[in-house]
Amino acid sequence: EPHSLRYNLTVLSWDGSVQSGFLTEVHLDGQPFLRCDRQKCRAKPQGQWAEDVLGNKTWDRETRDLTGNGKDLRMTLAHIKDQKEGLHSLQEIRVCEIHEDNSTRSSQHFYYDGELFLSQNLETKEWTMPQSSRAQTLAMNVRNFLKEDAMKTKTHYHAMHADCLQELRRYLKSGVVLRRTVPPMVNVTRSEASEGNITVTCRASGFYPWNITLSWRQDGVSLSHDTQQWGDVLPDGNGTYQTWVATRICQGEEQRFTCYMEHSGNHSTHPVPSGKVLVLQSHWQ
């Protein structure tokens, strides 16, 4: 899994007038890391591990750089021609990655009112845009502005690739990023569904990184995809993640089912409780 830095800048307009504030959220290796507004950036440590790593670092440099980026994005929003009444948003998402083989990727994406209308590969400088006419109109509008205004916006849009990677490398070097593995807690619960049927749910929580396999098996054999329902893998607010998978089974058949979990090279299987007993032994490898 590559190391990554992701900036999400948002500016707003109201009745055609660009608002003075901006909001930037920065994710480091998929974790909420910084949250910045016009005044300052604040570290957003999630749980004790982040506080330990981030310490009392001040974020003056990030505040300065991201304030500049916010101004640039506000200028871009001001040049979008189809400003209508009411509230509108322009979002710029920038992502850079450093892979295990030291290769890099970086890209930039623009969203207007939450809809993607323009992307750029920051390494090849190649632009792409969706097919819809609205997206294409917006894209042409913004691209033209960025070309015309390249001097005024400093070299922000051209140096972003290098800047993002430089910042990511700086964070990695300073030890902000911990390559850590936190195994999930897995528990299986049952609830009555309809007469003779029960829904069994397997929940994994408190794990990091986010990649996980969670699935139901009957008689040891994986159930087909369409007989299972999966929840999204979501942050749980502690710098870790949670998810679930559920399936419906006949009451009395519990002993034939196990939940299979795979995370960061570790595996475990978890049986279904019969009746009301919930504490069950699991097999960890």
């Epitope: 098996r217 008689d219 040891g220 009395g252 058949e253 034939r256 299987t269 019969s274 069950l280």
Partner: antibody
Amino acid sequence: QIQLVQSGAEVKKPGASVKVSCKAFGYTFTNYGMNWVKQAPGQGLKWMGWINTYTGEPTYADDFKGRVTFTLETSISTAYMELSRLRSDDTAVYFCARNYGNYLFDYWGQGTLVTVSS
Amino acid sequence: DIQMTQSPSSLSASVGDRVTITCSASQGISNYLNWYQQKPGKAPKLLIQYTSLLHSGVPSRFSGSGSGTDYTLTISSLQPEDFATYFCQQYSKFPRTFGGGTKVEIK
């Protein structure tokens, strides 16, 4: 600590029946099924079937259907295997094994030797 | 029924040797395979489930691999307590069937 404790060795005459018990300790008996496995002297392992300890429903392997019966006494966390119309080739060690997810045998009893001899 | 054929049926090895036991299924079993170890006069013990997943408490010198119809149990450095008989078991289909066993003896 999880343990399965089986009844002692039996010597039977051909045509008789034998009933082997398997008492479970250290876990909730009705959360896991129970398998029965036969091992003839110097031979491999042969699965006889399993019983759902929650519903009491047995599943028998074809080779043993009609001669074997699995039963339960859940109040004392015990499973039973009864084999009838015994023949000399039924001489074997019979194991109970906890049925985890109906695909693996994660804890085994110590085995019960049944000798069929005239 | 799915037939499980183990080879060799017996082998002699010394402490520290690398030992490989194979198990071949009469049809594809999609990695649905377990391995057990049995010592004389004792019940079998689960070693590996689902082809390669070590059961809790099993030393890391044991490993499993394979796919389709052919599967392998490897002991990277044989220890005195590893002299025993090893069985594979498929759970792709009912009835559950075991291999004939491989006896690992002291050379």
